[in-house]
């Protein structure tokens, strides 16, 4: 028969022959021959290959370096890489999560719109009229101004985006 020019899925062409690829978690030791199928060996401890492949070396699992604020989120297997995430209070600097930075805090006048996660930073928003934040925080939202009326009090000092209103007693007319 004519030697093939293309092979099926999960095969590769070598020496005019279609050989089976190694399954995920295994590396290539020897190409197939006329007499034997492809020979593969499992990846070693702390190694992986995540596709059908003809790689002669497995990839090393990612190292979650605690000096960079990283910790293991999901341990790698022979078929998957280790997934790193950041320690509490830190988040990844990139999608690959190779290092971490401290979550930013929202300054006074800004509140937390979205709390940071291991992979995303804090999202701040300016406190709108009627709301304030007087602290620098990675957790605090903008708080609504105190309603003096509900306390039978009157506004003595207007609130800002950084300060609450100051309530005081109503002035009574003397008879």
């Amino acid at each position: 028969p004519e030697p093939p020019t293309a092979c099926r899925e999960k095969q590769y062409l070598i020496n005019s022959q279609c050989c089976s690829l190694c399954q995920p978690g295994q590396k290539l030791v020897s190409d197939c021959t006329e007499f034997t199928e492809t020979e593969c060996l499992p990846c070693g401890e702390s190694e992986f290959l995540d596709t059908w492949n003809r790689e002669t070396h497995c990839h090393q699992h990612k190292y979650c370096d605690p000096n960079l604020g990283l910790r293991v989120q999901q341990k790698g297997t022979s078929e998957t890489d280790t997934i790193c995430t950041c320690e509490e209070g830190w988040h990844c600097t990139s999608e690959a999560c190779e290092s971490c930075v401290l979550h930013r805090s929202c300054s006074p006048g800004f509140g937390v719109k979205q709390i940071a996660t291991g992979v995303s930073d804090t999202i701040c928003e300016p406190c709108p009229v009627g709301f304030f934040s007087n602290v620098s925080s990675a957790f605090e939202k903008c708080h609504p101004w105190t309603s003096c009326e509900t306390k039978d009090l009157v506004v003595q000092q207007a609130g800002t985006n950084k300060t609450d209103v100051v309530c005081g007693p109503q002035d009574r007319l003397r008879a």
């Epitope: 999960k10 279609c18 199928e37 020979e39």
Partner: antibody
Framework: EVQLQQSGPELVKPGASVKIPCKAS????????MDWVKQSHGKSLEWIGD????????IYNQKFRGKATLTVDKSSSTAYMELRSLTSEDTAVYYC??????WGQGTLVTVSA | DVVMTQIPLSLPVSIGDQASISCRSS???????????LHWFLQKPGQSPKLLIY???NRFSGVPDRFSGSGSGTDFTLRISRVEAEDLGVYFC?????????FGGGTKLEIK
Amino acid sequence: EVQLQQSGPELVKPGASVKIPCKASGYTFTDYNMDWVKQSHGKSLEWIGDINPNNDISIYNQKFRGKATLTVDKSSSTAYMELRSLTSEDTAVYYCARRFAYWGQGTLVTVSA
Amino acid sequence: DVVMTQIPLSLPVSIGDQASISCRSSQSLVYSYGNTYLHWFLQKPGQSPKLLIYNVSNRFSGVPDRFSGSGSGTDFTLRISRVEAEDLGVYFCSQGTHVPWTFGGGTKLEIK
């Protein structure tokens, strides 16, 4: 012409080791894996393992892991199989074969006190 | 491991007869749409095995055309159309699809 030349018979004591050579000629040694096969007296054939001379990686039949070690010397186009901790169960003819197409003449290993 | 079962164990024949040897594997020898790595060997007394047929039906170089192989999946047959005296010996089937490679127990072709 492809030839695989094995050494003569070996008489070894129980507990000892033996290293059997298989000298290849007539082809490029690194182009083909070398397989090793055991044949006990009047019995069938058992595949021990093979070695890829390109990367020196061996694959073993689980049954012979720890019993056999396969190596190659590319400079002399020779494959070796070492058998250790020999017992009477290891008495057999051992063949080297170039991917089963070409076979050595076999080496008889007799384990006896 | 893949178990290779050969039938019969012994096959008495007369010179000029047709002979058939069966080999069955415990699992399919087709892997990932690839070749079917089923081979036949002849071992004459005091000699090493010689490859006759590879990949079910391909005659190895120098093998006479009275030898033929057939089969698929798990069932395979070696046929010798007209047995000659030099064909006597033990025939082994073997698989090279699943590591560890394994051999059948052998079929002894002998004169009736």
